[in-house]
Amino acid sequence: QQQTLPKPFIWAEPHFMVPKEKQVTICCQGNYGAVEYQLHFEGSLFAVDRPKPPERINKVQFYIPDMNSRMAGQYSCIYRVGELWSEPSNLLDLVVTEMYDTPTLSVHPGPEVISGEKVTFYCRLDTATSMFLLLKEGRSSHVQRGYGKVQAEFPLGPVTTAHRGTYRCFGSYNNHAWSFPSEPVKLLVTGDIENTSLAPEDPTFPADTWGTYLLTTETGLQKDHALWDHTAQNLLR
């Protein structure tokens, strides 16, 4: 006899990285017929929704209208059908960004390199942080973590055309509180024409939508949860 229901999916809209004082919605998708959803934050009950009519609803939304460092951390959700509870969802790491300062991102030997050259990114932030994150725009979740007193280096090694794209970095004050993003650095890797055509760039987006698509895209996530790449989330753990 089944003792628990399948775990629900949990995600954040527009994104799990939320600028401070901005709104975020935590979505929990379970099953039609669920009479209760519970959202837990850092292990404690945070919110409850009892959708009506339950047979017509399989997703609930928990709003956080004003993101701040107290609201950043790990969330999970569960749901109930009758008296039977689900397994808990995976953990959602909600990160508050735009805290304190803006790092500077630079690249050596430069933003335009030839395939096979060794490339290193440098992220510098003069305030009290020792952890840095380098992120490449797009859904592929290219994330690296680096350490240093005021600067971290991110060696990419010999690059290929797959490395081309737009990069930003953050200083991390703790796992769930990050700085403003650096200005973007676009890495252009030139190679022979055949190779270039085989390595399409990650999707490009207007610069002002940075926060809504970094690491993953809301639409892709909603259409198919299997598309969610856990690289960035796992990095936080």
Partner: nanobody, 130 residues
């Protein structure tokens, strides 16, 4: 901006009843989930009960279930906490709270964590003693 003012506290004997009121100013009150919390002397803040903006969904701390009833009248911009079968351990300052007012909340959602609440009243003291 929402301002909250509690009233109805006082001294009551064990087994007695009290009804607390929370009057809100601000046009958005009727769209905001609300809750009552309490803080006993020398202790931390504790969740008591929560209610959705529509009033159609409520949630209670286990120790208050069956004794306390949360309700609201959006036409009067007021929330209530009816407390029955009061015990000495219910002695505390009772606070009402409302969530931030910039989101379109579900009509059935309640928040149980104090960190979710942006607006707080000044509190009203309830003393249960013989």
């Amino acid at each position: 901006e929402v301002q909250l003012v509690e009233s109805g506290g006082g001294l009551v004997q064990p087994g007695g009843s009290l009804r607390l009121s929370c009057a809100a100013s601000g046009r958005t009150f009727s769209r905001l989930p609300m809750a009552w919390f309490r803080q006993a002397p020398g202790k931390g803040r504790e969740f008591v009960a929560a209610i959705s903006w529509s009033g159609g969904s409520t949630y209670y701390a286990d120790s208050m279930k069956g004794r306390f009833t949360i309700s609201r009248d959006n036409s009067k911009n007021t929330a209530y906490l009816q407390m029955n079968s009061l015990r000495a351990e219910d002695t505390a300052v009772y606070y009402c709270a409302a969530v931030g007012d910039s989101a379109p909340y579900s009509a059935t959602i309640v928040y149980t964590d104090a960190r979710a609440y942006a607006y707080w009243g000044q509190g009203t003291l309830v003393t249960v003693s013989s």
